[in-house]
């Protein structure tokens, strides 16, 4: 039977992720550094702007990917480049925290997109 | 060393359906998912599509207008890759391929499988 | 989707010239872009990730750069075993894409 047309990662199960990978975590893919982001100018985009550039850490590899997949979803999401602080730059768990503590408030919020 | 092992080369009818094999060795089969590419004889890279092992999560190109479906066996670390309706247009070397460096770039590929369709 | 168009489609060189193929994004991908090489009868084999960085064991001769829409695969001296095909790859979006390839040989 023909396979369905492929579901975008939820909201619920990009909290899972960020949830279980950052549980019991002191620190992520080394300690790596990353530039930190606005999340309010598009979170999905903004947060994969600044994690697409860390790589050899398979603990994010499905955060990035859900949030490859929720951002591809956005009317012209390549074409925005969202506000980034050139100036800042945090740890990886940091910015997942961030991130997490933002998509925690946008789901109790209700406003998915 | 990882290793993607692929199955052997199918000749189908068309409107038959073909289900190409990717076994693997080598590295831990849940941690990464595996993607498939196809490429038809003398032309580019097409991307298919990706199924993480470790949930069963999937994404699709939609160019194959949900003709592809991807499975993945945990126990045998096997991943497979089924093409319904298939017709001429879909005569290409069908590869497997893993990203662990970088996400969703293939570092490691299978020694590809040919899928012909004639009646 | 997002449309990657490589040029040249071919090119013809000389042992140690200097090879320079682009690959242009129908739009921002930011640094999301990565180099394949494949010989006849091969699977491709990724020389470059996030558009500059070189997988272990690629020669230092091939380097990329690049950034937003625009991006190069430089061979600083063109051996005789790099003679192939190569293709681009953006893995911002989903799908991801592939340009249509460059043809290079020896001439």
């Known amino acids: 039977s023909p396979s369905p047309v492929t579901p975008s990662p939820t909201l619920k199960e990009l909290i899972e992720e960020l949830v279980n990978i950052t549980q019991n975590q002191a620190s992520l893919c080394n300690g790596s550094m990353v530039w930190s982001v606005n999340l309010t100018a598009g979170m999905y985009c903004a947060a994969l702007e600044s994690l697409i550039n860390v790589s050899d850490c398979s603990a994010i590899q499905r955060t990035q990917r859900m949030l490859k997949a929720l951002c591809s979803q956005k009317p012209a999401a390549g074409q925005i480049s969202s506000e980034r602080s050139r100036d800042t730059k945090i740890e990886v768990i940091q910015l997942v925290k961030n991130l997490l503590t933002y998509v925690r408030g946008v789901y109790r919020h209700g406003n998915f997109r | 060393e990882v290793q993607l092992v692929q199955s052997g080369a199918e000749v189908k009818k068309p409107g038959a359906s073909v289900k190409v094999s990717c076994k693997t060795s080598g590295y831990t089969f849940i941690d990464y998912p595996m993607y498939w590419v196809r490429q038809a004889p003398g032309a580019g890279l097409e991307w298919m599509g990706y199924i993480d092992p470790y949930n069963g999560a999937t994404s699709y190109n939609q160019n194959f207008k949900g003709r592809v479906t991807l499975t993945a066996d945990k126990s045998t670390s096997t991943a497979y890759m089924e093409l319904s309706s298939l017709r001429a247009g879909d005569i290409a070397v069908y590869y497997c391929?893993?990203?662990?460096?970088?996400?969703?770039?293939?570092?490691?590929w299978g020694q590809g499988t040919l899928v012909t369709v004639s009646s | 989707e997002i449309v990657l168009t490589q040029s040249p489609a071919s090119l013809s060189l000389s042992q140690e010239e200097r090879v320079t193929i682009t690959c242009k994004a129908s739009q921002n991908v930011r640094n999301a872009v990565a180099w394949f090489q494949q010989k006849p009868g091969q699977a491709p084999k990724a020389l470059i990730y996030l558009a500059s960085n070189r997988y272990t064991g690629v020669p230092s001769r091939f380097s990329g750069s690049g950034s937003g829409t625009d991006f190069t695969l430089t061979i600083s001296s063109l051996e005789p075993e790099d003679v192939a095909d190569y293709f681009c790859l953006q893995h911002w979006n989903y799908p991801l894409t592939f340009g249509a390839g460059t043809k290079v040989e020896l001439k």
């Open positions: 391929a893993t990203a662990v460096v970088a996400t969703d770039v293939m570092e490691n």
